[in-house]
């Protein structure tokens, strides 16, 4: 099942997801002066069996002037582009997103690919947030988003993120400077991470952060 | 269970300096960036200040800033609030808090008069 | 003069559904931010009742319900009863005061 919406945005924060459901699917954009090739593939599709997943399809670009060839193109990773959901220097990778059962990696970059990525994100998605350059989280620990099903209709939680501005007090000399974490509820030290609620799910890529919103107080 | 255990309050002399303790338990109090609010008698709640989980950025309302000053200690989970130069309008219940915030604690009295 | 303006009073007779407004401004609810809502009964410490614009924490009746559209947020408490009787709080981040602002509160009477 498809999810409705973006994940949600916050303010001086981008997210990203480490690993991609079976499921997802990916425009097959291009950049200005770009266009996808004859019977080429709108869209690529995470697809897999219980022991291996990969992305179906393959997107290639062809230039807009150029009508009657057609390149078959190879991922360039050098030509890496800046997007919306990757490019995050996050300290917490959560586990190998290889190791993640039902799950497939970022595809490779294609030639000639736009600078965005448009993902189309499916239930049990999960994103991750960090503060932007310049901006600083609150909290330590992680900001996560998760695709839930509810009463038929899909939504993402709200990651509890505060990314803060300029600093009023200088950093110390050698203090380490505090990565992306939630403006979140404290967790009590006495909850028990396998309890899933409505708002927290989860899985072998959370269980190996600190997990530190949605607490069993609120249960 | 989560508790935030505010201290140091009373009547003091205007000019005069208070400092606050809050002491917390029941959670990861070093995950955390933690508030200072204010409710003067009858009135709404005023934010004051507000530290980051590890200490390393605070900032504060104009009407303490230069004035107050937030600290923490992560190894006794204790946040602190030293107030100088006080005055008759920083009369309030003091309440330290938690998160978004959500955990409050269950304030101390600050009464600047002469 | 508070940043998030509430009106200071409201009332309703029990049974009724009551809603309680928060108006920001573009850094605060206008810029993303989430708005949370409080209760505060008398003579007690603030208690949190809607985090995340309409999200409840566990304990609390899903009578009461919030919402968010553009620089405004509402609190809506339906089936009203007289254990209601507080002042509520609308809070936000403000990205120009680097700190949460508070709606000045409302009032609310049961009637």
């Known amino acids: 099942e498809l999810c409705d919406d973006d994940p949600p945005e916050i303010p001086h924060a981008t997210f990203k997801a480490m690993a991609y459901k079976e499921g997802t699917m990916l425009n097959c954009e291009c950049k200005r002066g770009f266009r996808r090739i004859k019977s080429g593939s709108l869209y690529m599709l995470c697809t897999g069996n219980s022991s291996h997943s990969s992305w179906d399809n393959q997107c290639q670009c062809t230039s807009s002037a150029t009508r009657n060839t057609t390149k078959q193109v190879t991922p360039q990773p050098e030509e890496q582009k800046e997007r919306k959901t990757t490019e995050m220097q996050s300290p917490m990778q959560p586990v190998d997103q290889a190791s993640l059962p039902g799950h497939c990696r970022e595809p490779p970059p294609w030639e000639n690919e736009a600078t965005e990525r448009i993902y189309h994100f499916v239930v049990g998605q999960m994103v991750y947030y960090q503060c932007v350059q310049g901006y600083r989280a609150l909290h330590r620990g992680p900001a996560e988003s998760v695709c839930k099903m509810t009463h038929g209709k899909t939504r993402w939680t709200q990651p509890q993120l505060i990314c803060t501005g300029e600093m009023e007090t200088s950093q110390f000399p050698g203090e380490e400077k505090p990565q992306a974490s939630p403006e979140g509820r404290p967790e009590s030290e006495t909850s028990c991470l396998v309890t899933t609620t409505d708002f927290q799910i989860q899985t072998e890529m959370a269980a190996t952060m600190e997990t530190s919103i949605f607490t069993t107080e609120y249960q | 269970e989560v508790q935030l255990l505010e201290s140091g309050g009373g009547l003091v002399q205007p000019g005069g300096s208070l400092r606050l303790s809050c002491a917390a338990s029941g959670f990861t109090f070093s995950s955390y960036g933690m508030h200072w609010v204010r409710q003067a008698p009858g009135k709404g709640l005023e934010w004051v200040s507000v530290i980051s989980y590890d200490g390393s950025y605070k900032y504060y309302a104009d009407s303490v800033k230069g004035r107050f000053t937030i600290s923490r200690d992560n190894s006794k989970n204790t946040l602190y609030l030293q107030m100088n130069s006080l005055r008759a309008e920083d009369t309030a219940v003091y309440y330290c808090?938690?998160?978004?915030?959500?955990?409050w604690g269950q304030g101390t009295l600050v009464t600047v008069s002469s | 003069q508070s940043v998030l303006t509430q009106p200071p009073s409201a009332s309703g007779t029990p049974g009724q559904r009551v809603t309680i407004s928060c108006t920001g401004s573009?850094?605060?609810?206008?810029?993303?931010?989430?708005v949370h809502w409080y209760q505060q009964l008398p003579g007690t410490a603030p208690k949190l009742l809607i985090y995340s614009n309409n999200e409840r924490p566990s304990g609390v009746p899903d009578r009461f319900s919030g919402s968010k559209s553009g620089t405004s947020a509402s609190l809506a408490i339906s089936g009203l009863r007289s254990e209601d009787e507080a002042d509520y709080y609308c809070a936000a981040w403000d990205h120009s005061l680097n700190g949460p602002v508070f709606g000045g509160g409302t009032k609310l009477t049961v009637l």
């Open positions: 808090a938690a998160g978004v915030p959500d955990y």
């Open positions: 573009s850094s605060n609810i206008g810029a993303g931010y989430d």
